[in-house]
Amino acid sequence: ELCDDDPPEIPHATFKAMAYKEGTMLNCECKRGFRRIKSGSLYMLCTGNSSHSSWDNQCQCTSSATRNTTKQVTPQPEEQKERKTTEMQSPMQPVDQASLPGHCREPPPWENEATERIYHFVVGQMVYYQCVQGYRALHRGPAESVCKMTHGKTRWTQPQLICTGEMETSQFPGEEKPQASPEGRPESETSCLVTTTDFQIQTEMAATMETSIFTTEYQ
């Protein structure tokens, strides 16, 4: 039921799930200098029954200075460069009750979490696309992709989206936000998932329940 590959890569665009289907896994990764606690969970899992979905297991990180034989899970710099990333504000919404039946919302950050989030999606997951700042969608309406099972094999539908840089120099209100890098993930990467996110609290944004993220590519 896990999707075999990642959602389609669209140049100058990023994607986000509104909610995560039961069965979705989120790797417990720690930032550099920290590691999972001994006997800590490898991942969080979206589970539930007909009326309630929540993330099982809690990710916990501790300082690597503490002598321990637990394997370091912080991504190495070369691995970080290869993964598709987005910047993310710290979610402010309650998270254990699902937004949609059979779905979990974005888990809150855990202490000393890695700058990337790696999700393993399941069949039926939908992700939504948005052109990064400075780029325009040529098509009208939303752009989305769904992981489907066809003839025993999973595939993501292709979103109707082309993001173009055709615009005058834009001036953005308030604080300047980082411009997107046009670089995409290398073709060779075929891991089972996966969105990753860079946590960053930005001012001026008060979100009630939505996953509050600003989307650019990792630089």
């Epitope: 939504y128 696309y129 939303p142 989305e144 005058e168 834009s170 001036q171 001026e204 996953t211 600003f214």
Partner: antibody, heavy 122, light 107 residues
Amino acid sequence: QVQLVQSGAEVKKPGSSVKVSCKASGGTFSSLAISWVRQAPGQGLEWMGGIIPIFGDANYAQKLQGRVTMTTDTSTSTAYMELRSLRSDDTAVYYCARGGSVSGTLVDFDIWGQGTMVTVSS
Amino acid sequence: DIQMTQSPSTLSASVGDRVTITCRASQSISSWLAWYQQKPGKAPKLLIYKASSLESGVPSRFSGSGSGTEFTLTISSLQPDDFATYYCQQYNIYPITFGGGTKVEIK
């Protein structure tokens, strides 16, 4: 076909706050921005700002920075606009409007709510 | 901020007339311009986006043209339902701004 249904008219005192809601009926939010536009009686249209529901990124008009907050609740497909420290010149019809494409909040508006009249009077 | 100047502010016309409304931007906005129609007590309705693209469901008598700083909305043959106020909107640069409106009234 998605429709945007807004909350009812409000009468407020100067200095108070108002929170207007905008619910997507007949569909759910996606990554299309929800913007807020107001129109004072007999006047033209003024863009207040916009937010992308799933992504959460918001942009506000400079003149309203610090007084306005836009949020969304994806579980109910509802957007909210809160305006604080109300003044008499905030009296207007407030519209929510959906962006026509996934180009952030810098977009045209293809679907509009019916409008919410907010009167600020002592 | 980009100023959007519409002319004329009021236009008197008869059914069947060809009507042209002009919108000027204080600086180039490429083709990122939309036109809306608004009737009293109602929300605006999108007619044209990206300067010349007709929104789905809008009658073909409406057309838009222009790029850079000069834009026009043309109604090829004015119908009774077209008497309303028309606004242009630029969405190239924040903040998004609207023209002051052109009221099309019955002559």
